[in-house]
């Protein structure tokens, strides 16, 4: 089996509590993309799901802005503009990590966090229970 | 802005690339998220933009295994089952956040990484250009 | 390769404990989550509780809780399942796996544990 | 927990016959659904991961579908070396496996 040598260019942590507590590194890689969907996409406007989307905000995260999806109706819009109740407009959902400041308002102090956000609706056949 | 007090009850960073390295506690939040609704939820076969989802894998990254969506059809599934090439299935994205070790086997170390994944499909009227 | 390499077999007393190790070779634990199934003789398989190395992170089944303790020990890539007070009923093969969250891809070969007074 | 009934409990077959296993959730579980196979004195081997998808090195002749409580395993053409024990797995909540199909020699 492979023993990792203690690798002398790791940073170390003085922690009582390591590995529980560790060191991350937030020069993003990739960091340079556009966060806001409004402008990287207009699908939720021209979807037949169509979908508002809410700046969630909040100071103690990381990131600090997170868009949540709302779907516009229970139903999709069909081909003559109006809204076919048969069908269900239903959110697509995502878990994703986050970083939380513990103890708040500490800069430099995080929690991980997995929290569930909604990216965008889509028009579904509805479950239809017989009844017996 | 918020400008946020420096907290005396705060860990203190030495890094002198504070505050781009920060502490971590990992006793993740909501780790037990397995009321999930990503999880039980069929949408990719109900949606009238179904798609497949493919594994990607990277056992250097955390999470290891993330599902991407790839839309089954270009068009969508009519009311009478057929694809519909008069609208367009199309990926929703969304970036996400996940760890990598960095330096590579260093326990206590890690590099925060923005990926953009594919969440799911809805169908959305296409874009026109008409020719003048 | 990933292989899964567990410790031997072994015989306890009801009421005593025991602490099976899973020793990756072949590679790191990575990114992974160990989890722990075990198979009574002649049953199906039953998930007891996992760990993800890199974090430390542990998820138990209800049933094992406060029964079974998991760890790892990422300088020797070696997981461990502890389980307590002991009853003849844990009598089983004890298998590690590693485990994406979705799935477990890789299985470490087994351990026989036997309860018997 | 989500209760995974298989069926049938056990199988009587041949080399070359198609055989076909089926698993339902207790609840739906999307398509979180995995198969796999066990021989005597060896620990399981997954086949199926996503309910359809194949695992590298597993041959095509095993196959699987289905979504939310119904799932299926499909061995096209059986072959000497598939007579085993097939479990279903869900991992939509914490897993739970199916009680097992024994496929026996006809």
């Known amino acids: 089996g492979i023993t990792i040598p203690r690798n002398p260019g790791c940073p170390n942590s003085e922690d009582k509590n390591f590995p529980r507590t560790v060191m991350v590194n937030l020069n993003i890689h990739n960091r340079n993309t556009n966060t806001n969907p409004k402008r990287s996409s207009d699908y939720y406007n021209r979807s037949t799901s169509p979908w508002n989307l809410h700046r969630n905000e909040d100071p103690e995260r990381y990131p600090s802005v997170i868009w949540e999806a709302q779907c516009r109706h229970l139903g999709c819009i069909n081909a003559d503009g109006n809204v076919d109740y048969h069908m269900n407009s239903v959110p697509i959902q995502q878990e994703i990590l986050v970083l939380r400041r513990e103890p708040p308002h500490c800069p430099n102090s995080f929690r991980l966090e997995k929290i569930l956000v909604s990216v965008g609706c889509t028009c579904v056949t509805p479950i239809v229970h017989h009844v017996q | 802005g918020i400008t946020i007090p420096r907290n005396p009850g705060c860990p203190n960073s030495e890094d002198k690339n504070f505050p781009r390295t920060v502490m971590v506690n990992l006793n993740i939040h909501n780790r037990n998220t397995n009321t999930n609704p990503k999880r039980s939820s069929d949408y990719y076969n109900r949606s009238t933009s179904p798609w497949n989802l493919h594994r990607n894998e990277d056992p250097e990254r955390y999470p290891s295994v993330i599902w991407e969506a790839q839309c089954r059809h270009l068009g969508c599934i009519n009311a009478d089952g057929n694809v519909d090439y008069h609208m367009n299935s199309v990926p929703i994205q969304q970036e996400i956040l996940v760890l990598r070790r960095e330096p590579p086997h260093c326990p206590n170390s890690f590099r925060l990484e923005k990926i953009l994944v594919s969440v799911g499909c809805t169908c959305v009227t296409p874009i026109v250009h008409h020719v003048q | 390769q990933v292989q899964l390499v567990q410790s031997g077999a072994e015989v306890k007393k009801p009421g005593s404990s025991v602490k099976v190790s899973c020793k990756a070779s072949g590679g790191t634990f990575s990114s992974y989550a160990i989890s722990w199934v075990r198979q009574a003789p002649g049953q199906g398989l039953e998930w007891m509780g996992s760990?993800?190395?890199?974090?430390?992170?542990?998820n138990y089944a209800q049933k094992f809780q406060g029964r079974v303790t998991i760890t790892a020990d990422e300088s020797t890539s070696t997981a461990y399942m502890e389980l307590s007070s002991l009853r003849s009923e844990d009598t089983a093969v004890y298998y590690c796996?590693?485990?994406?969250?979705?799935?477990?891809?890789?299985w470490g070969q087994g351990t026989l544990v036997t309860v018997s007074s | 927990d989500i209760q995974m009934t298989q069926s049938p409990s056990s199988l009587s077959a041949s080399v070359g016959d198609r055989v076909t296993i089926t698993c339902r959730a207790s609840q739906g579980i999307s398509n979180w659904l995995n198969w796999y196979q066990q021989k005597p004195g060896k620990a399981p081997k997954l086949l199926i991961y996503a309910a359809s998808s194949l695992q590298s090195g597993v041959p095509s002749r095993f196959s699987g579908s289905g979504s939310g409580t119904d799932f299926t395993l499909t061995i096209s053409s059986l072959q000497p070396e598939d007579f085993a024990v097939y479990y279903c797995?869900?991992?939509?909540?914490?897993?739970?496996f199916g009680q097992g199909t024994k496929v026996e020699i006809k």
């Open positions: 797995q869900q991992y939509s909540d914490d897993p739970t």
């Open positions: 796996a590693r485990d994406s969250e979705y799935y477990f891809d890789h």
């Open positions: 760990i993800i190395p890199w974090f430390g992170w542990t």
